[in-house]
């Protein structure tokens, strides 16, 4: 029951996390520029991985895609790639984990198969979460190291004077959504991996074997009290094959290779 709960909770947490990663990737507010008051209207600029937007005090918003930009830095492309890889891995992980859920029966799928699928999806969620966290962190680092403009940069060009309007960039909401979502996906993945251990069928450390010499009526059974007193699998005191030696689980089944040891 605890395993099923852990697996189910891991799935739900990862699902929320991946939804958050998708949301963060699509959001425009990765970086925001301080609001500045133009004599005409107050303008608020913000930008995401795919486009830049302007919102006026009137409520009017205009967004433009980066496809018109002449050169996008490799770091931005890397962040895009990390987020997309995170989404793809997360989506595959979700698909795998649906079939791995203990509460869902698909044909005659064994617990060992479900355990393997749970582990696979767990690892995928962990990698997905790490990709998202890495992507968001790289972007945040870009803002902190490269794009903080503390002074207004002025110069005179051919067309007259030019000066920067905004003075600095700040973290946008998408960064926080991305960090939280990545963390949730990571936690969900860890929970799936923990659930996998509980799903895997445990193997016994030893197999009790019955030995007896041919022609003798008493069989020597290693394995302690249970074995010697007949409390093992041979509880109905069925005759043990003469000259044979086999594991307890095979006592009531067909002869095995151990019969001829």
């Amino acid at each position: 029951m605890a395993v099923t709960a852990c697996q189910g909770l891991g799935f739900v947490v990862s699902l929320i996390g991946i939804a958050g990663i998708i949301a963060a990737t699509c959001m425009d507010q990765w970086s925001t520029q301080d609001l500045y008051n133009n004599p005409v209207t107050a303008v608020f600029n913000y930008q995401g991985l795919w486009r830049s937007c302007v919102r006026e005090s009137s409520g009017f918003t205009e967004c433009r895609g980066y496809f018109t930009l002449l050169g996008l830095p490799a770091m931005l492309q890397a962040v895009r790639a990390l987020m997309i890889v995170g989404i793809v891995l997360g989506a595959i992980g979700l698909l795998v984990s649906i079939f791995a859920l203990k509460c869902i029966r698909i044909g005659s799928m064994e617990d060992s198969a479900k355990a393997n699928m749970t582990l696979t999806s767990g690892i995928m969620f962990i990698v997905s979460g790490l990709c998202a966290i890495a992507g968001v962190s790289v972007f945040a680092n870009m803002l902190v190291t490269n794009f903080w403009m503390s002074t207004a940069n002025m110069y005179t060009g051919m067309g007259g004077m030019v000066q920067t309007v905004q003075t600095r960039y700040t973290f946008g909401a998408a960064l926080f959504v991305g960090w939280v979502a990545g963390g949730l996906t990571l936690i969900g993945g860890v929970m799936m991996c923990i659930a996998c251990r509980g799903l895997a069928p445990e193997e016994t450390n030893y197999k009790a074997v019955s030995y007896h010499a041919s022609g003798h009526s008493v069989a020597y059974k290693p394995g302690g009290f249970k074995a010697s007193t007949g409390f093992g699998s041979n509880t109905k005191n069925k005759k043990i094959y003469d000259g044979g030696a086999r594991t307890e689980d095979e006592v009531q089944s067909y002869p095995s290779k151990h019969d001829y040891v």
């Epitope: 930008q47 009017f60 205009e62 930009l69 050169g71 931005l76 004077m161 000066q163 309007v165």
Partner: nanobody, 123 residues
Framework: EVQLVESGGGLVQPGGSLRLSCAAS????????MGWYRQAPGKQRELVAG???????RYADSVKGRFTISRDNAKNTLYLQMNSLRAEDTAVYYC?????????????????WGQGTLVTVSS
């Protein structure tokens, strides 16, 4: 390089009309607010009229009802239709724009000024 080029200035009689144009050229990603400013001899530069991307306009009290600002976002061009001109409208008219260049990321908005066009209202 991004630049603003004004045109349409000249000598006009009081009560006459003029239409100023301002074309933004260069690698432009987007333009936020565009406006016209003027500076009369011995006076400070003042806002005449401004227009945002969304169409929000603002006029100086002295030109309300006489001047009309408009812009063509597709052509990155700003216009100022000046009617019922007076002698006190004589000044150098400057075009101003808050724009982002298409040469860098993240998108940085710059306040760009034109070199100005002279408008003289005299009989």
């Amino acid at each position: 390089e991004v630049q603003l080029v004004e045109s349409g200035g000249g000598l006009v009689q009081p009560g006459g009309s003029l239409r100023l144009s301002c074309a933004a050229s260069g690698s432009i990603f987007s333009i936020n607010v565009m406006g016209w400013y003027r500076q009369a001899p011995g006076k400070q530069r003042e806002l005449v009229a401004g227009i945002s991307t969304g169409g929000t306009t603002r006029y100086a009290d002295s030109v309300k009802g006489r001047f009309t600002i408009s812009r063509d976002n597709a052509k990155n061009t700003l216009y100022l239709q000046m009617n019922s001109l007076r002698a006190e409208d004589t000044a150098v008219y400057y075009c101003n724009a808050d724009l982002a260049t298409a040469t860098s990321w993240p998108v940085r908005y710059l306040e760009v000024w034109g070199q100005g066009t002279l408008v003289t209202v005299s009989s």
